[in-house]
Interface confidence: medium
């Protein structure tokens, strides 16, 4: 049905032809996500009179299907305007039942008309900056994050679960306002581990779940990115001892994700998520990456379980064969790894052992080659001055931050990136902070050793002397050439 | 049945051994010595890495060595405000407030008088009123069309603290200072068995003989130039744009026979002033044939690519092209910030409407 | 363990206005919704109001609808109950109480109570 038809049935006022109006409409736009430019003006006038409804109130035996037109024509850039004022959005608000009021809404609200009215609220935020605002000031936050605390007591059907987070984290992402008022007053580390715990059904004891089944992997993943949203700028602050513990509990939660995979083909993108919020712990809540105990089966280095260490250098692998979004595909994990092997000698060894094994094929360039080290030496040249740095900081603490062993395993060429930003092209301190870390050298590194050019990092044989067979003056001719190009250069 | 060896032939073969690692140690002493040359444009923040250098490891410059800086400063600051004091007249932009005049004529008394590592109250007070004017901000935006020091406005917007008299410049102030290098400075530094020489390389001709053993066997180049150069336009004494004017240089460098077998690191400098001016100043003033978009990661690779296709002898020879932004010390910390309103734009972008 | 403190009653003539506070000494407070309560001088002890964990959400008593308004700060562990109009019949001993359950008027969903601060309206 046109919208200028369902326009008009509206404007007649006859209750049972505008309600067959708006199912037809329904019906034949659920799918749209596009809209059609010639009929916009109708679209708009359509809206302009939902919303005078809607801000009225909705007879209660048809709002789902109002809502559901509604829910259409918000995903219309052209109609924001109209949905985006503080009374339609109180209205849904209201129906979503995370209006901030004085008195509960008595009856126990219909599961069909919140969802739809959640949705709805999903669309407006995303797309409309005024929305974002409103939604902001109406706090609606608050709210949300108390039905998420009602979670353990009441159920909520999957759906509307989903929705609040959704809602949850646009309102995250958007505003940074909410993110403060959801981390600070509403303690939303907290409300959203117990969450995370609760979705994932584990207790921190237990070992690993094998699979994550499909509704719970999507509520998860909302939860690890809401998360994400109110840490990033909150915990580069010192933590105290209790905060610690709780992040020191979430980080036992993230060991589970990571060792868990999700229903369908969503693993990667669930561990994404969780890694993204590894990032984000304080510094000093990451032993708990590696304080799982040791069982049959498990990946033991130095005494200590690398099942989880192992689990991200594996994600790392798969991240390094993709070209698209990489700086936010590999910068995490490598930020993740290099804080762990910087405070931790086993799981530097451990991942010197994997990434830098001691050299034995010394003819070929660092970056040339398809180990992980290869690909790794290969971003420190990056156009991306931050997947640079992050590959290179990686490689560099590997080293235990000895500038020889780091030339020695990437090349001063690939190497000069990092040395010249952090001020040690030209030495600085003679060895890294970890002076009990060894480095082995194999009998082919030591039988090269003398052919290895450090720039290249790899055995190359001496070059004929270009000048060879010259006199003095016909070099001198020739650095003089030289000398008249620097002195261009240099004005 | 096997074979055993005598105590004498024993100690041949110790002896041989111990022969040929002799000559690998000597082998390896010669091969272990790595020569570099350090070479860049005036302002391709070459001497910044040097400075660099000194700022994170060795605890930074001393408050002495910091002290020394405050002349170079000064005259870096008045320098800055008498290039676009001047570019007004050949751009004729009138200043904002006629008074302003006056004071542009007292600034060139002023600077004439002034004493090396001071600056008076009156010369401060002229220098501040003169880069507040809306006619010398609108001369500075243009400084693209002529030659002005990167470190002007840092400089000029913290006039109040330099004109103070008992300053003394900061590590930052230390970075941004510009001193025209010349002649050759040479480096030793050792990295475990590795010795590194390294020549920075200025434009004075000294005797001949020093830059012959300069050239000869040099491992690598280090060649630096500043990014945010490839919209200047041209002194009237100049024939090319100044990224053209490297360019050039480069292919002469790179492809020079003293330099067949030499690697190349090339530092692409001031990557964060490009980042800001790409996004007003196309790349088609530098490069007209260029076709790409002008966000930084399209120009930046367009540009790199530019150098590194001069290299004629890409099978023998590496070029390892590294990004930088040099007078930024804090860059250097390792953080995980920069990513993340990548992260959150992009798991925005991944969500649909319902 | 949760310990409340009531804090901010005391005297004052018909019309006026009073504000209590309730601290507490957990930082875990701040997930639990909290109510008010009086009683009367020879009386049950009766519901005044309650406010949700987060703040989302309250509920008044007939009797004090439009007058009192509660309100939390979570940053500092604090629920206020803001008295205005007083009447003689507001006289009595208020009490503050917490629910890890949920907020509403039983007396028995909440597990903590405070001590009580005398609220006297004279006429």
């Known amino acids: 049905m046109e919208p200028r038809a369902v326009a008009d049935a509206l404007e007649t006022g006859e209750e049972d032809a505008v309600t067959e109006a708006l199912r037809s409409f329904n019906r034949e736009h659920s799918q749209s996500f596009t809209f059609d430019d010639a009929q916009q003006e109708d679209r708009k006038r359509l809206a302009k009179l939902l919303v005078s409804v809607l801000e009225q109130g909705l007879s209660p035996k048809h709002r789902v299907t109002w809502l559901q037109t509604i829910r259409i024509l918000s995903r219309d850039r052209s109609c924001l305007d109209s949905f985006a004022s503080r009374q339609s959005l109180h209205a849904l608000a209201c129906y979503a039942d995370i209006a901030i009021s004085e008195e509960p809404i008595p009856q126990p609200p219909d599961m069909d008309v919140l969802l739809e009215s959640l949705k709805c609220l999903c669309n407006l935020v995303l797309s409309s900056p005024t929305a974002q605002m409103l939604a902001a000031e109406a706090r609606l936050v608050v709210r949300l994050a108390e039905r998420v605390g009602l979670y353990r007591k009441r159920s909520y059907p999957h759906e509307v679960q989903f929705f609040d987070l959704r809602l949850l984290f646009l309102l995250t992402a958007l505003r940074t306002d909410v993110r403060q008022q959801l981390f600070q007053e509403l303690h939303g580390v907290r409300l959203l581990t117990d969450a995370l715990e609760l979705t994932l059904g584990v207790a921190p004891k237990e070992n690993p779940l094998v699979i994550l089944p499909a509704q719970e992997t999507e509520r998860a993943m909302e939860i690890l990115k809401v998360l994400f949203n109110i840490t990033y700028d909150s915990v580069k602050r010192e933590v105290d001892e209790e905060d610690a513990a709780l992040y020191r509990y979430l980080g036992t939660l993230l060991r589970h994700c990571v060792m868990a995979d999700a229903a369908g083909d969503r693993t990667e993108e669930f561990h994404g998520h969780t890694v993204n919020l590894l990032g984000n712990l304080p510094l000093k809540c990451l032993d708990v990456l590696l304080a799982l105990e040791l069982h049959e089966g498990s990946l033991e280095f130095m005494g200590v379980n690398m099942d989880v260490i192992n689990a991200l250098l594996a994600f790392l692998e798969k991240r390094l064969h993709q070209t698209h979004r990489l700086k936010e595909c590999v910068a995490p994990v490598l930020s993740v790894l290099t804080e762990c092997a910087r405070m931790h000698r086993p799981a530097r060894k451990f991942l010197k052992a994997q990434v830098l094994p001691p050299l034995r094929d010394v003819r070929t360039r660092p970056e040339v080659g398809d180990l992980l080290r290869n690909k790794l030496v290969r971003l420190m040249t990056h156009l991306d001055t931050d997947v640079k740095r992050v590959a290179a900081e990686f490689l560099f603490v590997l080293c235990s931050e000895s500038v020889p062993r780091f030339i020695k395993y990437t090349g001063y060429g690939n190497a000069a990136g990092l040395l010249a930003a952090r001020g040690l092209m030209a030495g600085g301190r003679p060895e890294g902070q970890y002076s009990e870390d060894e480095d082995t050298d194999t009998e082919e590194y030591r039988e090269a050793k003398a052919s290895i050019n450090p720039v290249t990092g790899r055995v190359e044989e001496k070059p004929p002397n270009p000048m060879e067979g010259m006199t003095e003056e016909q070099k001198e001719h020739e650095a003089m050439k030289l000398v008249n190009m620097f002195d261009k250069l240099s004005r | 049945m096997g074979c055993t060896l005598s105590a004498e032939d024993k100690a041949a073969v110790e002896r041989s051994k111990m022969i040929d690692r002799n000559l690998r140690e000597d082998g390896e002493k010669a091969a272990r010595e790595v020569k570099l040359l350090l070479l860049g444009a005036g302002e391709s923040g070459k001497s910044t890495i040097v400075k660099q250098m000194k700022i994170i490891h060795e605890a930074g410059y001393s408050e002495e060595e910091c002290k020394q800086y405050k002349a170079v400063v000064y005259s870096n600051t008045i320098q800055s405000i008498i290039a676009i004091i001047r570019a007004m007249g050949r751009l004729k932009i009138d200043f904002g407030d006629a008074a302003r005049a006056d004071d542009a004529r007292q600034l060139f008394v002023l600077a004439g008088a002034a004493e090396e590592g001071f600056m008076t109250a009156e010369l401060a007070g002229v220098i501040k009123r003169l880069w507040k004017d809306s006619g010398v901000q609108a001369c500075f935006n243009r400084s693209r069309e002529y030659q002005l020091n990167d470190s002007a406005a840092y400089y000029l917007n913290d006039l109040d603290r330099i004109a103070q008299p008992n300053y003394i410049p900061t590590q930052q102030d230390v970075l941004r200072t510009r001193v025209k290098t010349t002649g050759i400075v040479e480096t030793h530094f050792t990295f475990k068995d590795l010795h590194f020489k390294m020549f920075d390389v200025g434009g004075q001709r000294s005797e001949r003989k020093k830059w012959i053993h300069c050239f000869e066997g040099v491992t690598a180049i280090i060649f630096c130039v500043a990014l945010s150069d490839y919209d200047l336009v041209l002194a009237e004494d100049e024939e090319m744009n100044r990224m053209h004017e490297s360019m050039k240089l480069f292919d002469s460098i790179c492809n020079n026979k003293w330099f067949t077998d030499t690697s190349i690191i090339l530092f692409l400098n001031k990557k964060d002033l490009f980042e800001e001016k790409i996004k007003k100043s196309p790349l088609t003033i530098c490069y007209p044939e260029y076709a790409g978009s002008n966000t930084y990661e399209e120009a930046a690779a367009y540009i790199q690519c530019q150098f590194e296709d001069l290299n004629k002898r890409k099978d023998t020879k590496e070029i390892y092209t590294h990004f930088t932004c040099a007078t930024d010390t804090k860059n250097v910390q390792f953080v995980f910030d920069a990513v993340t309103d990548v992260i959150i734009k992009n798991n925005l972008k991944d969500c649909g409407l319902f | 363990q949760v310990q409340l403190v009531e804090s901010g009653g005391g005297l004052v003539q018909a019309g006026g206005s009073l504000r209590l506070s309730c601290a507490a000494s957990a930082r875990t407070f701040s997930r639990y919704g909290a109510g008010w309560f009086r009683q009367a001088p020879g009386k049950e002890r009766e519901f005044v109001g309650a406010i949700t964990w987060g703040g989302g959400r309250t509920k008044y008593a007939d009797s004090v609808k439009g007058r009192f308004t509660i309100s939390r700060d979570n940053s500092k562990n604090t629920v206020y109950l803001q008295m205005n109009s007083l009447k003689s019949e507001d006289t009595a001993v208020y009490y503050c109480?917490?629910?890890?359950?949920?907020?509403?008027?039983?007396?028995?969903?909440?597990?903590?109570w405070g001590q009580g601060t005398q609220v006297t309206v004279s006429s």
């Open positions: 109480a917490s629910s890890s359950i949920e907020f509403g008027p039983l007396e028995d969903t909440y597990d903590y």
